[in-house]
């Protein structure tokens, strides 16, 4: 599992010797170090929206921000896959889609994003405090999962301001551009470290706000998500999980799976106009495979999802499948 780079809080330098210039040169290496450590890390974003017209209807959208090829997407609710979550849909880019009640329609939006319409009545009906998770098995990165839910205060049908979000796909130009900047940054960091090697090391103290806070992104679009507090997964309110779960089976798989034919998409569509899809403010979760999550704060307009993602420590498809049955 990749180590998380924490950006420690720096004590202000002694007045005089370096002054403002000294402060800048002390902070910059840490920012660049974070940039180097987090370079090329794939991410998963999750958007959950309740339809204004049908209060029991949800739309879950998930996307993968990475250069790899997606080999499987698993959407679950009630927690991450293999950690008590119940599979709602599995999408394979070549073989098609499998979905189970209360999922109504799962489909590929682009080659790296999917959507799932969920509806139900009675026991299998989702509600506002249900947590939905998306797990992307990608080649060659491995498995990445993120979770999201509507906060209790959300109004039905509410979404982020209709401002265009950046295109949610890592194209070649972007990769090359970022790679160049990162390479320059890393070289510059080495240069700075060499310059400072004879100077006394600055006194560092750990951040008081949250010892487990996700690492700060160098280009962090959401400050709130950087300082998000991690709490145990057990605190998630899953009172709206279906009461008819097949508890006789350890994987928690439902015994009421859909018996109607699924959406017959056998290949993802080409990249659609996802740039115009508004990403809702709030209601996003950052998921950690070991059972931690954090609610990401409101993000400013004109920014794409900036969720911090943690890789599956057990590698791709570690549970041998979405239900973790063996």
């Amino acid at each position: 599992m990749r180590t998380e780079a924490q950006v420690p809080a720096l004590q202000p330098p002694e007045p005089g010797l370096e002054g403002a210039m000294g402060h800048r040169t002390l902070v910059l290496p840490w920012v660049l170090l974070t940039l180097c450590v987090t370079a090329g890390t794939p991410e998963v974003w999750v958007q959950v929206r309740m339809e204004a017209t049908e209060l029991s209807s949800f739309t879950i959208r998930c996307g993968f921000l990475g250069s790899g090829s997606i080999s499987l997407v698993t959407v679950s609710w009630g927690g991450p896959n293999g950690a008590g979550g119940t599979t709602l849909a599995v999408l394979h880019p070549e073989r098609g889609i499998r979905q189970w009640a209360p999922a109504r329609q799962a489909r590929w939006e682009t080659q790296s994003s999917i959507s799932l319409i969920l509806e139900g009545s009675g026991a299998s009906s989702p509600c506002a405090n249900t947590t939905f998770c998306c797990k992307f098995a990608s080649f060659p990165e491995g498995s990445w999962e993120a979770c999201g839910s509507l906060p209790p205060s959300s109004d039905p049908g509410l979404s982020a301001p209709p401002t265009p979000a950046p295109i949610l796909r890592a194209d070649l130009a972007g990769i090359l551009g970022v790679s160049g900047v990162l390479l320059f940054g890393c070289v510059y960091l080495l240069h700075l470290l060499r310059r400072h090697k004879h100077r006394p090391a600055p006194r560092l103290q750990p951040s008081r706000t949250s010892p487990q806070a996700p690492r700060a992104r160098a280009w962090a679009p959401s400050q709130a998500s950087q300082a998000a507090l991690h709490v145990p997964y057990a605190t998630i309110n899953t009172s709206c999980r279906p009461a008819t779960l097949d508890t006789a089976h350890p994987h928690g798989g439902p015994s009421w799976w859909a018996s109607l034919p699924t959406h017959a998409a056998h290949r993802p569509q080409g990249p659609a106009a996802w740039a115009s899809t508004p990403i809702p403010a709030r209601g996003s979760f950052v998921s950690v495979e070991n059972g931690l999550y954090a609610q990401a704060g409101e993000r400013p307009p004109h920014t794409g999802p900036g969720l911090t993602l943690f890789p599956d420590p057990r590698g791709p498809r570690a549970m041998e499948g979405p239900l973790g049955v063996r």
Partner: antibody, heavy 117, light 107 residues
Amino acid sequence: EVQLVESGGGLVQPGGSLRLSCAASGFTFSNYDMHWVRQATGKGLEWVSDIGNAGETYYLDSVKGRFTISRENAKNSLYLQMNSLRAGDTAVYYCVREEFGHGMDVWGQGTTVTVSS
Amino acid sequence: DIQMTQSPSSLSASVGDRVTITCRASQGIRSDLGWYQQKPGKAPKRLIYAASSLQSGVPSRFSGSGSGTEFTLTISSLQPEDFATYYCLQHNSYPFTFGGGTKVEIK
């Protein structure tokens, strides 16, 4: 214990029909794709057909139009209706479980189908 | 259809030997590949899934590697019970296809 038990094999004349059954136990049957795989004596394995959780079906080209895969989730049962049988269909037929997208993990012991005059 | 070319078709080895079997796909299949062991008169048993993940209960001397079009099954130290026929299977697209098999015999 997860188990798949095939039945229905036997000797049949070319052009005849046979219906194979597979009884599943020890897991939630409706959660899985189910497959039929065959193996002629002394030969390699050959995939025959797949049925998804909601009834989506897929076939090997050489059996399309002759074989029909079906499932009865309430009975934890998988079937393969084989019509217009040919000598080339002679093989041991295995019932196999697959968690969609993750490959075949559990196999039955097989049932033998012999097509001969 | 995706063709799976498995080599060698047979090999002779001794207990303790390191054995390598390869499978080549006619087109990219990401990591949608499994390795199976079959003994005479028995059903196949899965050893490796997702190209490189060890099936629960399978000894760690078995390992898988590769992705895309080239895949390898390695037995680090051959044991008497490992003499069998090994198959690769691609489940990336329909129809699923198996490699032709590799029979591992006692030298």
